[in-house]
């Protein structure tokens, strides 16, 4: 069945979620009427290659084309007016960055997959197996089910042949005993002899048949188990973890991990038959011990295979401890696996074993390092305390799927103070947010005879004492996660492996798609590229060290790359996100790039792009105007920083943007957003109408007070040569000497910095055509 | 599931000889045949027991009927000597997994579930 057919009949809530992944950017109706086409397509590869996606591009606009026709015969006048303007948006939107749309086109195809895969799993859960969406599992996954289901199968059959060869050893034991009491045995000397030696060959043959039934037993058990240990290996080496490379990749801002139902339903269904196993392995030793003989097969194999049975068991219990959600503090839900010491932390592990029985038995006890108190001496490695509840009792009642599990909500870490300012050692090789900690849960299982010793530990953490190494402790999570699936290496920082572009590039895109409604295009991780490894064609397989990403400042910056970066996000995320959400923030340009794009574009056609000098995050807006002579000009206005957009919201700095031009007369550069959505409509509704900037007047007073606007001003020369930022304190001398102004970030032609005018209140009042 | 399966039917003489066996596909406590002739009622023809190995028989039979067991085999067979004209009828093999099969598993007034063979026809010709 199509994927979008199967979307369709999904339950409400995923609706919700698939309502979220289509804006105007790929508009769901176009989804909906070229759907098979759509699914066709090789979009992935499109969104790599432009020659491709300019092919897909062309051939989209096609399919639209036909599909218009298909309305026209069928007088469907409104979806023909849609279709219509759909196509318009698309070849201005997407007509010179083809593989943009691509890449979108394939992010939603690939998120609608995982949705279904979810309510795949959900549907599992809630016995819909007829849904359509439960035929969401892969092939190995089938063939998974195929050998668990082999697996029950053989165990009851088991248990059928465990009867007979039960009923026979009794029959068996009844006629000898009978025999022996009558005296039979002693007999065959006498009248009875050939009744006797008739009695005797039948014992005889029943015990052979005991025997062959024994040895058949036996062999069927040892099939059993190495059947049993296939499974346990592709479930745990294959199944749980893919789930833990996927909590990983979740944990750093990738596609959020599957839920774990189906892997606990597999998993207790191949421990419950471990159990009733090893029930029928205990039951061979009691065969054993009421009829025993010489080349007895239990005497024989018995011992091995209550041995290998124990230890799969065993080992599928230790498996099936995990960690279901990783330490993360809950005011910072986006950036797990960084702990500020004396803030509150969660965490949760769970048991993928659902046994009943076991509810509210298992203590978990959580510490930290536990096995490197003597390496983290060695280190110099700060030491910590687990402070709150570090003892929860796993049960099956808190979680709403019953899943038998402990959520720790009131941890803290305190640092363990030494006479050195807290480090162990005051060589230590590592900064704080690269020493890495491990979080270890704890607990001690007894069932059915067996105790076993089950432990598990979070994903390494970093420990951070102020929220300003939060950049810092993100990025080294960032890496750690990105590069590396062994679960426990905190040595992973003495010598930092290597990443690739294109691995960074994805994860960088994941610190946006995380938190806002978009990640970034290829055109935004090309610009990223050429800032990491410097211009280049293609960025593809390209090393990035550690150093680089994080650690050393980028050239003629200084700040180091991920620091830039990481502001930007806090920037996107805390003041621009609706606008970045829109995709009417291009982000990330190269000046070239933006010239290019610019110059062919009408006067007043702007776009908006963060600043590459400033570390603390800005943004700003580039412009297109014709000087006197009637040259094109490109202009930039000083990045807006956090500060000053805490004052005034960014959609209202543009709406209200001004140069005060030779004559004194404000005038609005800012037209059209690129390529050609006029300003109006792109941030209109992000601002406040006016009525609503201040109260009304005081009824008390006779008239009512004159309204008030703030807005942004850059006075400017008629010559338009400024290339640097102009201060206001210093403009008259700047006019004068044009002398450089520090930190500047150079630009394509001016570069000019805003000055507020408050209307009502400034001296310097001027008036403005509002 | 116990599955069963006849052989050895066929034509004999009155007054001749003929072997029936039954292997069944897992072991059971009680093992027997049964017969039904055109027009009749099934009834019990011998029974043998897992222990004891005492074999019950219907009436008719006593004395030309012999039944014995290969317990590595998992077989029943029925040794049919002076074979009469009013032996003819279709004999199916029969087992229960109790060990309990004296007569009143013949006369099928005993309790518990009993398997069935598809039969084997044994035609009397004088």
């Known amino acids: 069945m199509a994927q979008w057919n199967q979307l369709q009949q999904l339950d409400t809530r995923y609706l919700e979620q698939l309502h979220q992944l289509y804006s105007d950017s790929f508009p769901m109706e176009l989804r909906q009427f070229l759907a098979p086409w759509i699914e066709s397509q090789d979009w992935a590869y499109a969104a790599s290659k432009e020659s491709h996606a300019t092919l897909v591009f062309h051939n989209l606009l096609g399919e639209i084309d036909q599909q218009y026709s298909r309305f026209l015969q069928e007088s469907n006048v409104l979806y023909q007016h849609n279709l219509r303007r759909i196509k318009q948006f698309l070849q201005s939107r997407y007509l010179e960055k083809p593989m943009e749309i691509a890449r979108i086109v394939a992010r939603c195809l690939w998120e609608e997959s995982r949705l279904l895969q979810t309510a795949a799993t959900a549907a599992q859960q809630g016995g819909q197996a007829n849904h359509p969406t439960a035929a969401v599992v892969t092939e190995k996954q089938q063939m998974l089910e195929q050998h668990l289901q082999d697996v029950r199968k053989r165990v009851q059959d088991l248990e059928q042949k465990m009867k007979v060869v039960e009923n026979l050893q009794d029959d068996f034991d009844f006629n000898y005993k009978t025999l022996k009491s009558q005296g039979d045995m002693q007999d065959l000397n006498g009248n009875n002899q050939s009744v006797t030696r008739q009695k005797m060959q039948q014992l005889e043959q029943m015990l052979t048949a005991l025997d062959q039934m024994r040895r058949s037993i036996v062999s069927e058990l040892a099939g059993l188990l190495s059947a049993m240990e296939y499974v346990q290996k592709t479930l745990t080496d294959e199944e749980l973890a893919d789930w833990k490379r996927r909590q990983q990749i979740a944990c750093i801002g990738g596609p959020p991990n599957i839920c774990l139902d189906r892997l606990e339903n597999w998993i207790t269904s191949l421990a419950e038959s471990q159990l009733q196993t090893r029930q029928q392995i205990k039951k061979l030793e009691e065969l054993q011990q009421k009829v025993s003989y010489k080349g007895d097969p239990i005497v024989q194999h018995r011992p091995m295979l209550e041995e290998r049975i124990v230890e799969l068991f065993r080992n599928l219990m230790k498996s099936a401890f995990v960690v279901e959600r990783q330490p993360c503090m809950p005011m910072h839900p986006d950036r797990p696996l960084v702990i500020k010491t004396g803030v509150q932390f969660t965490t949760k592990v769970r048991l993928l074993v659902k046994f009943p029985e076991l509810n509210y038995q298992l203590k978990i006890k959580v510490c930290i390092d536990k096995d490197s108190g003597d390496v983290a001496a060695l280190r110099g490695s700060r030491k910590f305390n687990i402070l709150g509840t570090n003892t929860k009792v796993m049960n099956m009642e808190e979680s709403n799927n019953g899943s038998l599990s402990a959520e720790f909500k009131h941890l803290t870490l305190r640092e363990q103070r030494c006479g050195n300012g807290g480090r162990a050692n005051c060589d230590a090789s590592l900064i704080v947010t690269e020493e890495l900690h491990l979080i270890t849960f704890e607990t001690e299982v007894y069932h059915q005879g067996l105790k076993i010793d089950l432990e598990t530990h979070s994903l390494p953490v970093v420990v951070i004492s102020n929220i300003c190494q939060m950049p810092n402790a993100w990025a080294s999570i960032l890496w750690y996660n990105m590069l590396t699936n062994n679960p426990k290496n905190v040595n992973f920082f003495t010598k930092p492996p290597i990443g690739t572009w294109d691995q960074v590039a994805e994860v960088l895109s994941w610190q946006f798609s995380s938190t806002t409604k978009r990640g970034l295009s290829i055109e935004q991780l090309t610009t990223l590229a050429e800032k990491l490894l410097g211009p280049g064609v293609n960025y593809s397989g390209c090393q990035i060290t550690w150093a680089k990403f994080c650690k050393e400042n980028m050239a003629g910056k200084g700040f180091s790359f991920w620091v830039w970066l990481d502001n930007i996000i806090d920037l996107v995320k805390k003041y621009i996100l609706a606008l970045w959400n829109e995709g009417y923030i291009m982000g990330f340009i190269s000046k070239e790039r933006e010239r290019a794009i610019l110059s062919t574009k009408p006067p007043g056609t702007f776009l908006l792009r963060f600043s590459e000098s400033s570390k603390e995050g800005g943004v700003t807006f580039t412009w297109v105007e014709k000087d006197i002579s009637g040259k094109t000009q490109i202009q930039s206005v000083e990045p807006y920083t956090k500060q000053q957009l805490n004052n005034m919201s960014f959609a209202e700095i543009i709406m209200g943007y001004k140069i005060m031009d030779a004559t004194n007369i404000l005038v609005s550069p800012l037209v059209y957003l690129y390529p050609d959505i006029p300003k109006e409509e792109a941030f209109g509704k992000y601002c406040r109408p006016e009525s609503q900037e201040h109260p009304e007047a005081d009824p008390g007073s006779a008239a009512p007070y004159l309204k008030t606007k703030f807005i942004c001003v850059t006075p400017t020369t008629c010559s338009n040569t400024i290339d640097l930022p102009m201060s206001p304190r210093t403009l008259d001398s700047l006019m004068q000497f044009g002398n450089n102004g520090e930190g500047a970030e150079p630009s394509a032609g001016g570069q000019f910095e805003s000055l507020t005018f408050d209307m009502e209140l400034t001296s310097e009042c001027a008036t403005s055509p509002m | 599931e116990v599955q069963l399966v006849e052989s050895g039917g066929g034509s004999v003489q009155a007054g001749g000889s003929l072997r029936l066996s039954c292997v069944a596909s897992t072991y059971t406590g009680c093992m027997g045949w049964f017969r039904q002739a055109p027009g009749k009622e099934r009834e019990g023809v011998a029974a043998l027991s897992s222990r004891g190995f005492a074999g019950h028989y219907t009436d008719s039979v006593k004395g030309r009927f012999s039944i014995s067991r290969d317990y590595v085999k998992n077989a029943v067979y029925l040794q049919m000597n002076t074979v009469k004209p009013e032996d003819a009828a279709m004999y199916y093999c029969?087992?229960?997994?109790?060990?309990?099969?004296?007569?009143?598993?013949?006369?099928?007034?005993?309790?518990?579930?009993?398997?069935w063979g598809q039969g084997t026809l044994v035609t009397v010709s004088s």
């Open positions: 029969a087992a229960r997994e109790g060990w309990e099969c004296g007569e009143t598993w013949l006369d099928r007034t005993a309790g518990g579930h009993t398997y």
